[in-house]
C-alpha cells in the first residue's frame, strides 16, 4: 500500500516520498526509487523562500524610483527584496508596491507620530492651552505663551490654532 | 543538555489502556518532528508512530492502526502515545525520539534520522 | 510496506578486525537510510544518516555506503567499544522500518 504522508521536508508524488528542494533552489526534477530529487539555485534576480517544489523561482520585487521607492534590502537567493519609500513619503500598504506624501497636520492640530517609510503622520486636536498656526508634517502643538512668567496679562485669548497675546499690565494712576 | 525522558509505562491487562508521555528539554520542541520506536524483550526495533512538528501530519505502524493514538502538547514540550485495546504483543519498551533533518548548502537533497532517544519505558501487556 | 533485510544476523569478530554489515531494501529507497548501534539496556545510537554520513561525535572508522536496495555499514578497525547490535532504518516514507539486527560479539 502506497504512503499517505510524508515527513515534513518531502513530498508525496508517485507513491514516493521526495526530498523538498531547499530555500533558494527550484525542482527540476522529481525523485524517483532510485534517483534523488533534483533541484538547481534559483537565478540572480530570483528567491524561494520557502522548502519547495516549485519549477520556477520567483523574480525579486522591483523597487520603482517613479512611485517614489527604493531598496531597504536587497534580495538574495532565500529573499525578497524589501522596498521603503523615499524620506517625505510612505507605503500606501504592507507589500510597499506605492508611496504618498506624508500628510500633513492642518492649523489646530499637531503631530502626534512622525511619519515613518511604512506609517503615515498621526495628527491631534491641539488640546486647550496649546496651539499650531502651521501646517506640518513635524510640528507638534505650543503651549500657549505664559503671560504671568513675563509679568505681563493675556490682552488675546488663545485658540487651538493662535496663541495667545499678551500685553503689559494696566498701571493704577 | 538535550534529553527525552519517556514515563507511563506499567503492567496493564490486555484489553487496557495506557498513555506514556515523553518529556523534551534542551531544544526547540515544537520545532521538530517526533516518533515512537518500541523494541519487545530480546527482539529488534519496531517504529510505531510518527507526528509532524505542528502535530497535523501523524502516521502508525499497520500493528498498532486503530488502537494508538499520537499527539504533543508543544506549549508544555510534551509527547504522548495513548495506547488502547493493548495485547500481549504490545509488551515491550517504548522509546520516544527525535526526527532530524540534516542537509547542507550544496544543493543534495537532505537526509532523516533519530538523533536523540529517550531512555524508554516498559510496558507489559499480562492477564 | 519496505522491507529491510540485514545479513549477517550475528558477527563474531575480534579487536582491530574490519567488518561489513549489509542491509537490502525490498524496493528502492535512494539513501534514505540511517545506521544505530545499540547496547544492552540502551536506547540506540545514530551513527550514519543517508546512507554514508557520518553523524557528529561519531569515529571516522564507521562507513556507510550504497544508494537504491543495497547498503552496508563497515566498521574499519573493531574497537572493544564496537561491540554491539546494529540496526538499519528506511526514512524514505511511511511506516518507517527498521532491519532486524546485527548482533556483533567478541571472538
Known amino acids: 500500500e502506497p504512503p499517505t504522508a510524508c515527513r515534513e521536508k518531502q513530498y508525496l508524488i508517485n507513491s514516493q516520498c521526495c526530498s523538498l528542494c531547499q530555500p533558494g533552489q527550484k525542482l527540476v526534477s522529481d525523485c524517483t526509487e532510485f534517483t534523488e530529487t533534483e533541484c538547481l539555485p534559483c537565478g540572480e534576480s530570483e528567491f524561494l523562500d520557502t522548502w519547495n517544489r516549485e519549477t520556477h523561482c520567483h523574480q525579486h520585487k522591483y523597487c520603482d524610483p517613479n512611485l517614489g521607492l527604493r531598496v531597504q534590502q536587497k534580495g538574495t537567493s532565500e529573499t525578497d527584496t524589501i522596498c521603503t519609500c523615499e524620506e517625505g513619503w510612505h507605503c500606501t500598504s504592507e507589500a510597499c508596491e506605492s508611496c504618498v506624501l506624508h500628510r500633513s497636520c492642518s492649523p489646530g492640530f499637531g503631530v502626534k507620530q512622525i511619519a515613518t517609510g511604512v506609517s503615515d503622520t498621526i495628527c491631534e486636536p491641539c488640546p486647550v492651552g496649546f496651539f499650531s498656526n502651521v501646517s506640518s508634517a513635524f510640528e507638534k502643538c505650543h503651549p500657549w505663551t505664559s503671560c504671568e512668567t513675563k509679568d505681563l496679562v493675556v490682552q488675546q485669548a488663545g485658540t487651538n490654532k493662535t496663541d495667545v497675546v499678551c500685553g503689559p499690565q494696566d498701571r493704577l494712576r | 543538555e538535550v534529553q527525552l525522558l519517556e514515563s507511563g509505562g506499567g503492567l496493564v491487562r490486555p484489553g487496557g489502556s495506557l498513555r506514556l508521555s515523553c518529556a523534551a528539554s534542551?531544544?526547540?520542541?515544537?520545532?521538530?518532528?517526533m516518533n515512537w520506536v518500541r523494541q519487545a524483550p530480546g527482539k529488534g526495533l519496531e517504529w510505531v508512530s510518527y507526528?509532524?512538528?505542528?502535530?497535523?501530519?501523524?502516521d502508525y505502524a499497520d500493528s498498532v492502526k486503530g488502537r494508538f493514538t499520537v499527539s504533543r502538547d508543544n506549549s508544555k514540550n510534551l509527547l504522548y502515545l495513548q495506547m488502547n485495546s493493548l495485547r500481549a504483543e504490545d509488551t515491550a519498551v517504548y522509546y520516544c525520539?527525535?526526527?532530524?533533518?540534516?542537509?547542507?548548502?550544496?544543493?543534495?537533497?537532505?537526509?532523516?534520522?533519530?538523533?536523540?532517544w529517550g531512555q524508554g519505558t516498559m510496558v507489559t501487556v499480562s492477564s | 510496506d519496505i522491507q529491510l533485510t540485514q545479513s549477517p544476523s550475528s558477527l563474531t569478530a575480534s579487536v582491530g578486525d574490519r567488518v561489513t554489515i549489509t542491509c537490502r531494501s525490498s524496493?528502492?529507497?535512494?539513501?534514505?537510510l540511517a545506521w544505530y548501534q545499540q547496547k544492552p539496556g540502551k536506547p540506540p545510537k545514530l551513527l550514519i544518516y543517508?546512507?554514508?554520513s557520518l553523524e557528529g561525535g561519531v569515529p571516522s572508522r564507521f562507513s556507510g555506503s550504497g544508494s537504491g536496495t543495497d547498503f552496508t555499514l563497515t566498521i574499519s578497525s573493531l574497537q572493544p567499544e564496537d561491540f554491539a547490535t546494529y540496526y538499519c532504518?528506511?526514512?524514505?516514507?511511511?511506516?518507517?522500518?527498521f532491519g532486524q539486527g546485527t548482533k556483533l560479539e567478541i571472538k
Open positions: 525520539a527525535r526526527d532530524v533533518f540534516f542537509f547542507d548548502s550544496s544543493g543534495s537533497p537532505g537526509a532523516y534520522g533519530m538523533d536523540v
Open positions: 534542551g531544544f526547540t520542541f515544537g520545532s521538530y518532528e
Open positions: 507526528i509532524s512538528s505542528s502535530g497535523e501530519t501523524t
Open positions: 524496493q528502492g529507497i535512494r539513501s534514505s
Open positions: 543517508g546512507a554514508s
Open positions: 532504518q528506511q526514512l524514505n516514507s511511511f511506516p518507517s522500518t
